[in-house]
């Protein structure tokens, strides 16, 4: 914590300018009253302070604001929320997308992975739902930012706003906010003919259940691998070797590239190795000829 | 084939939660989302809201605050817990399975279970 | 949300004539309908989806039409066994939101 001390008359300050600059940290300490701080925010970011006093200057937010800064402060932080931990922006109220698109610009280049995710968080908190604009917001100005927010957050998602979601924007997301975005893709993309819905569902697929992926075998779509590997493992599980070449068409052949690796090892395991050769792809690892298949899970189900 | 089965107690006391399950069998609750709907005696039906087998869920806004939808998949079974009942939730409560599968693209319900009625009352 | 509204509320047919019920929503939901059949003490059955196409061992004599608000449930020639609550739901968006029912019965 920076020593407290008397501010010396000639130092006292009644703006924020470039003369501050010259001030030492227990200077701007004493001398820079937070009220007057607070109502001249838009000025601060122009003025090339170090990081050292920009720690001055953000200590005298926080004892002015202990439960957080109000928007009006946020909106002009600039440079200043380099300095602010995920901590600090929890207390944080944001509903303007234009304080939400300054913040992410002045974060671009810097590791504020953490800080950026709390921030989308507010921003969702405060808006009431993850609504088209913060959508737009994100995709323009935080590529792959919508992957941030828990599935809690992105369940705010109309159906309807998801048709401004790039595939790009999705590629950090994790399973948990696949299985939360992909009912609301096929809902919002119901009404389109098969090969315009495969094109705009696609990248959300790996949030399908069994069914659908089944479904999607029988219309020709040529999946590509890349697609295929992302599909949940136990999507993937159930599908018979006549539908995975049905759902992969001319891919298929990139089944043996990716033979060891999940979903395709698991889903080779679960096959008969004569179906498996039928592929001709020299898949090995499938259930030998004249082995019993019992599925215990159905089962224990019943049981 | 695949067959639904829902239980739970019959009479629940007013403030008190409501607790159903669903159980699944003759087939993997992994394949499909499985819903709740409801129907109060002589009325109409009332979607409660859906569950995927991660746990992933979404409800009617009009029961959003009072609803949990759980899953678990190694007994093949979701639930529901509506907090906070009245006399208005007394209703037939049916589990039931949406299709929705994209070769015909929609949210609607192919396979339901026989259903159980909850009264509210005390 | 989006409101479905059946008529008639009651529909009074003999055995093997036509009869024809009506659902309306609020809002446009495409092709995105749904039908039901119910009987007292049991759950509904499925008998049309997308507006129009029988589900699986669905009888011809149903028939559905329509599309955007305005929708139509057919029944050519009433068996016995038709005489029952008949439900449209929507599933255009959430929340998924039923009629409430036209109940046919035996003139």
């Known amino acids: 914590d920076v020593e407290r001390t008397t501010c010396p008359p000639e130092k006292e300050v009644h703006e924020i300018d470039e003369s501050l600059i010259f001030y030492k940290k227990r200077e701007l300490e004493a001398c820079v009253d937070a009220a007057l701080l607070a109502a001249q925010m838009d000025r601060v970011d122009a003025i090339p302070f170090t990081y050292e006093q920009l720690d001055v200057l953000k200590h005298k937010l926080d004892e002015l604001y202990p439960q957080g800064y109000p928007e009006s402060v946020i909106r002009h932080l600039g440079h200043l929320f380099l300095k602010m931990s995920p901590e600090d922006i929890r207390k944080w109220n944001v509903t303007s997308l234009e304080t939400l698109k300054a913040l992410l610009k002045v974060s671009k280049g810097h590791e504020m992975s953490a800080q950026v995710a709390t921030l989308i968080d507010r921003v969702v908190v405060g808006r009431g739902q993850l609504d088209k604009d913060t959508v737009d917001t994100l995709t323009a100005f935080c590529p792959g930012c919508l992957c941030s927010l828990s599935p809690e957050r992105l369940s705010s998602v109309p159906p309807s706003v998801i048709g401004a979601v790039r595939p790009q924007d999705l590629d950090t997301c994790g399973p948990r906010q696949l299985d939360v975005l992909y009912p609301k893709a096929r809902l919002a993309f119901q009404n389109m003919s098969g090969s315009e819905y495969f094109v705009k569902i696609r990248p959300f697929l790996g949030g399908a259940p069994t069914e659908d992926v089944k479904a999607l075998s029988q219309q020709n779509v040529s999946m590509d691998l890349a697609t295929f590997m992302k599909l949940r493992r136990e999507a993937v599980l159930p599908l018979t070797v006549a539908e995975v070449q049905k759902l992969l068409g001319p891919h298929v052949e990139g089944l043996k590239v990716e033979e060891q690796h999940s979903p395709v090892r698991d889903w080779i395991l679960k096959q008969r190795q004569d179906d498996l050769d039928t592929l001709g792809l020299g898949l090995q690892g499938g259930i030998p000829n004249g082995y019993l298949i019992l599925d215990l899970s159905v089962r224990e189900a019943l049981s | 084939q695949v067959q639904l089965q829902e239980s739970g107690p019959g009479l629940v006391k007013p403030s008190e939660t409501l607790s159903l399950t669903c159980t699944v069998s003759?087939?993997?609750?992994?394949?499909?989302?499985w819903s709740w709907v409801r129907q109060p005696p002589g009325k109409g039906l009332e979607w409660i809201g859906y569950i995927f087998y991660s746990g992933s869920t979404n409800a009617n806004p009009s029961l959003k605050s009072r609803v949990i939808i759980s899953v678990d998949t190694s007994k093949n079974q979701f639930s529901l817990k509506l907090s906070s009942v009245t006399a208005a939730d007394t209703a037939v409560y049916y589990c039931?399975?949406?299709?929705?599968?994209?070769?015909?693209?929609?949210?609607?319900?192919?396979?339901w279970g026989r259903g159980t009625l909850v009264t509210v009352s005390s | 949300e989006i409101v479905m509204t059946q008529s008639p509320a009651t529909l009074s047919v003999s055995p093997g004539e036509r009869a024809t019920l009506s659902c309306r929503a609020s809002q446009s939901v495409n092709s995105n309908l749904a039908w039901y059949q119910q009987k007292p003490g049991q759950a509904p059955r499925l008998l049309i989806y997308?507006?129009?196409t029988r589900a699986t061992g669905i009888p011809a004599r149903f028939s559905g039409s329509g599309s955007g608000t305005e929708f139509t449930l057919t029944i050519s020639s009433l068996q016995s066994e038709d005489f029952a609550v008949y439900y449209c739901q929507q599933y255009n968006n959430w929340p998924l939101t039923f009629g409430q029912g036209t109940r046919l019965e035996i003139k």
């Open positions: 039931a399975r949406e299709v929705g599968r994209i070769a015909v693209a929609g949210w609607f319900f192919d396979l």
């Open positions: 997308g507006a129009s």
């Open positions: 003759g087939g993997s609750i992994q394949n499909y989302y």
